[in-house]
Amino acid sequence: FERTRSLQDPCSNCPAGTFCDNNRNQICSPCPPNSFSSAGGQRTCDICRQCKGVFRTRKECSSTSNAECDCTPGFHCLGAGCSMCEQDCKQGQELTKKGCKDCCFGTFNDQKRGICRPWTNCSLDGKSVLVNGTKERDVVCGPSPADLSPGASSVTPPAPAREPGHSPQ
């Protein structure tokens, strides 16, 4: 790594993956192991994120980019850059302080994460219940009884929500 020649700031020519070493006459030195600099002109390198415990490594740290974490099986990522891992529950459950608990009657959760939500109230839209709700599925609303005349079109139930993955959001 050669010494930079910038008149303004001798550190400005230090590329990503290096730092401007004040202890060595502002020479561009490579980032030490387990550290990185993602932009040029940095005076220090950042310590790499450690994906430990409930976090696991999705992408290894390099000299120019931080490590990326996701969560171990049985947990899912939350937050920007997977800053948190939350325990999975089964469909039909929600996570409480005391662990996974079944959804109360009248509520459902079709994912392994999140909270139980109330069944749709079909009558608010002037419709009737075509398929009863369960802990895992919302009710399916059908046409109102008045619409059930010969020739009326059938109702297609909504597709189930996609299961969340374990990758960062």
Partner: antibody, heavy 116, light 107 residues
């Protein structure tokens, strides 16, 4: 430079609700989290919950479950925190803070006073 | 919940002194630890994240170390503007929790 600007001080009576806003400006294009932290007089900060600006995902501390609602208005780049069923123990300063990892940018705080 | 305990709760020091504040977690948090400085009537200000990374714009006299359950914030040479309250905070497990604070006062 990221800036978080919170709404003004509030005085409430026990049993009431309070809704505080936190407007983000500057680099608000990235996917980041807005956390809410409260601090009672002379006490340590207490984490309340967060919302993700990208997908609206939100979680609250179990201590406040059922009493706190955190929302995000994308068009206004503003987070809101509503706390219901207030008691005198809810008196304190409420902060919003942005995080792409640590809580790196904070709002100025909103003083909430609950008294009869 | 993970309990964060700081020591000492307060200390008196002079300008130029080396100051060390410790923080202990009730269970292992790897390097998911941050340090904040808070002055009266102001929001906390991030100093150190991921145990030892200095936040941009923070003077190099602040440093952090540790791993697992025991962590340290060091101010190598105390300056007049450093008199404040310091908090550690873990972000390994929700709810994120803070230490009770260490107040650094002028001797």
């Amino acid at each position: 430079q990221v800036q978080l600007v919170q709404s003004g001080a509030e005085e409430k009576t026990p049993g009431a609700s309070v809704k505080i806003s936190c407007k983000a400006s500057g680099n608000t294009f990235n996917n980041y989290d807005i956390h809410w932290v409260r601090q009672a007089p002379g006490e340590r900060p207490e984490w309340m919950g967060w919302i993700n600006s990208g997908n609206g995902d939100t979680r609250n501390s179990q201590k406040f479950q059922g009493r706190v609602t955190i929302t995000w208005d994308t068009s206004a780049s503003t987070a809101y925190m509503e706390l219901s069923s207030l008691t005198s123990e809810d008196t304190g300063v409420y902060f919003c803070a942005r995080a792409e990892g640590p809580l790196d940018y904070w709002g100025q705080g909103t003083l909430v006073t609950v008294s009869s | 919940d993970i309990v964060m305990t700081q020591s000492p709760s307060s200390l008196s020091a002079s300008v130029g002194d080396r100051v060390t504040i410790t923080c202990r977690a009730s269970q292992g948090i790897y390097n998911y630890l941050a340090w904040y400085q808070q002055k009266l009537g102001k929001a906390p200000n991030l100093l150190i994240y991921a145990t030892s990374n200095l936040q941009s714009g923070v003077p190099s006299r602040f440093s952090g170390s540790g791993s697992g359950t025991d962590f340290t914030l060091t101010i190598s040479s105390l300056q007049p503007e450093d008199f404040a309250t310091y908090y550690c905070q873990q972000s390994y497990s929700t709810p994120w929790t803070f230490g009770q604070g260490t107040k650094v006062e002028i001797k």
